[in-house]
Structure formats: structure tokens, C-alpha cells
Amino acid sequence: IWELKKDVYVVELDWYPDAPGEMVVLTCDTPEEDGITWTLDQSSEVLGSGKTLTIQVKEFGDAGQYTCHKGGEVLSHSLLLLHKKEDGIWSTDILKDQKEPKNKTFLRCEAKNYSGRFTCWWLTTISTDLTFSVKSSRGSSDPQGVTCGAATLSAERVRGDNKEYEYSVECQEDSACPAAEESLPIEVMVDAVHKLKYENYTSSFFIRDIIKPDPPKNLQLKPLKNSRQVEVSWEYPDTWSTPHSYFSLTFCVQVQGKSKREKKDRVFTDKTSATVICRKNASISVRAQDRYYSSSWSEWASVPCS
């Protein structure tokens, strides 16, 4: 048993038929010694008396809010949550496996630049009686500070008969050094509680591996005289790290016809302009990627040819 926060405790249970469970001793937080009784949740049934209560926790019926009273007055509460381990593996019932980039990916994180700021998100079909809290650090044995805001509900989607909820959190490394080579990964830990079930989820990554630039900005076309060619120009996104001479991007320029079946013409360049042939009803799109490290491409920025 361990304390998640004040008066909230997690009991770790091996979950199999006829498992013996865990013996837990609860202590009433009071200077009183006599006349103390214990109840669970809203029940008025007295479970025991005295300053301590010993219980055998085997199932969710044994979890909940234990309250000690004296003469009708509430003295203190202890909320017991269960963390299930089945066949040596902690349960992951609350969050949805996003399966990207691999199976058992419950948390996904992205950074727009090397400032040490990043966003993580997760999905669930559960909405009621649900709590998420997030902690983060760089390294785990001698952790360096990363500050995360409170998690937020960031999207609701209907998926068939189910509603899917996306939650996200923004974090910032306290003493980020954008130009430094990372040697210790960032660790993100999400505590999830649904009703009386506790689970925790972790993700470990280097900022360089989760970089995804914003799309190029100010995408413009300039027709070239007496030619079907156009000069496409764009700028680095505002959110990208500076100086651009050091934090350089490479770009992919694509000409795409109206029909998805039409052949796409692609040009790769380190410059912020390119010359391409603009076909009727086509559109021109540009995306960006870190020039020196193959992390994710940005989303496309697009303009019509006409």
C-alpha cells in the first residue's frame, strides 16, 4: 500500500481467482483513543471499532472511502484504490491503446521545437468518475525538473456507438538547453483513476524524437512569365527554434491534382522557395522536417494553383 495523495491510498493486488489479497491497517487521524467506529462509503454498518482497523483487501468491494467516527462526528477519511496486476502485468483498462507508432502506446507526445516545451495526449471511452494527474522529469534516478500544467479535456469524438475523449497536457522543461545533445530521456507519468481503480501510464522519449514542426507559413505562388511554372515561396513557422541557421528545416513541395489517383510531383529542398509546374485544378503543398534529424514531418500547408 502506498499514498497517492493526502488520505488516498493505492493497494497493489495480484489479481487471480481466490487470491489472498493484501492486509491493510488503517489508522484514524485523531488524538482520540476511545469510542471510535469505522464505516465504508455511505453504509452505516460498523466495520470495527478502535483507533485502527485491519481489513483484508481482495476485490473492489473492499475498496472505497473508510471513515472513522466518534459520537456521530467524522474524524478522518481514507480512500482506498486498487491497482490490479494480472499475470505479472499491471492493468491498462482506462486508456485506449493508440497503436501508433507501436502497440501498447497509451501516451503520445509532440514538441514543435527544441525549447523543452511539449504536449502529450491520451484517449479513453470513459468519462464519468475519472481523474488524471501528470508528473514529468528528465531522467529518473537523479530527476531534473519538468513542470506540467493540469490535464485538460481537449476533444470529444463519436466513434461508432462510442464517444471517445482526448485529454492532453502541456509540459515545459525547467532548465531547457535547446542546442544541447540530450543524454537522459524525458519521463512522463500519468496517474489515472476510474471509480476505485488506479492505473499508471508512462512514456519515455528524447525531445529530438518527438519533434514535429508546425506547417510552413505564408505560402505564396508567383507565376513565371510565359511559362506554366510558378515560384512557390514560404517561411519557417513562427514556433520553430531560432536561429534558423542552426535549427534548420528541410522541405517537401508537392503538386497534387484534384483526383487523389493523379500522380503527385514532389520536390525536396532546403531553401524556402521552389519552382514547380502548376497544373489546372491542382494544389501545391509544402511541409517541413528537421534538416539534420529525421523526426516527424509537419502537416501540409496548401494553396490552390488557380
Epitope: 480512500l79 500544467g149 493540469a150 490535464a151
Partner: nanobody, 122 residues
């Protein structure tokens, strides 16, 4: 730390509206997710609604969805609960609460106000 003071409760007829306010003191208000919770006599405290620190997507208990609206004004350090089409079963003490977590559970809020009584008569 954040201190919370609710106001706006009262006695109304079924079908009427009320607007609760919660004034927060402390510069950190804008970093907390805020919630409204309620407790009817002899019942457990129950979750009503929550709004995130960035005033993003609010979330409501099914029992109040479509009738209640939670909002916040970070410039005024205030969170609101607009309650329309009130029913007798909405009678309770309403609490404003703050959390560093996202929670649709009454159990995981860190800071609580003293509460304001809402009574809906039929």
C-alpha cells in the same frame, strides 16, 4: 494555494434559473482546473461540472447536461455555474473546487469553498 468563496444560491421555483459565482484569491487561479460539486442532505458529494484552466471543453454530469453551463473568467479569478430549468432534485449545497488534476469525481479536488445552498421548490 487558492481560497474559494461561492455566492448566488437561494430558494427558487422549479423551472427557474440561478447563476452561481465562485471568487478565487491567489495568483495561481489560472493554472487550476475548476469544478462545481454538490451535496444533497444525507447523500454523497457528487460531481456537477468542470472546466479546465485554459477554459477549454467543459464536462458535465449527465444529470445536468443541457441545463447547466460552467464558465470562467481568468481576468476576474471567477468561475460561474449558470443553472437553467432547475428541478427539485437539484436541491443541494453547491461547492466550488480547484484541482491540479482533471477530474469528474468529487473525490479528487484539492481546494474547496464553503458552499452555497440551492433550494428548488415544486
Amino acid at each position: 494555494e487558492v481560497q474559494l468563496v461561492e455566492s448566488g444560491g437561494g430558494l427558487v421555483q422549479a423551472g427557474a434559473s440561478l447563476r452561481l459565482s465562485c471568487a478565487a484569491s491567489g495568483r495561481t487561479f489560472r493554472s487550476y482546473n475548476m469544478g462545481w460539486l454538490r451535496q444533497a442532505p444525507g447523500k454523497e458529494r457528487e460531481f456537477v461540472a468542470t472546466i479546465s484552466w485554459n477554459a477549454g471543453i467543459p464536462y458535465y454530469a449527465d444529470s445536468v447536461k443541457g441545463r447547466f453551463t460552467i464558465s470562467r473568467d481568468n481576468a476576474k479569478n471567477t468561475v460561474y455555474l449558470q443553472m437553467n430549468s432547475l428541478k427539485p432534485e437539484d436541491t443541494a449545497v453547491y461547492y466550488c473546487a480547484a484541482s491540479n488534476s482533471w477530474s469528474s469525481s468529487a473525490r479528487f479536488y484539492d481546494y474547496w469553498g464553503q458552499g452555497t445552498q440551492v433550494t428548488v421548490s415544486s
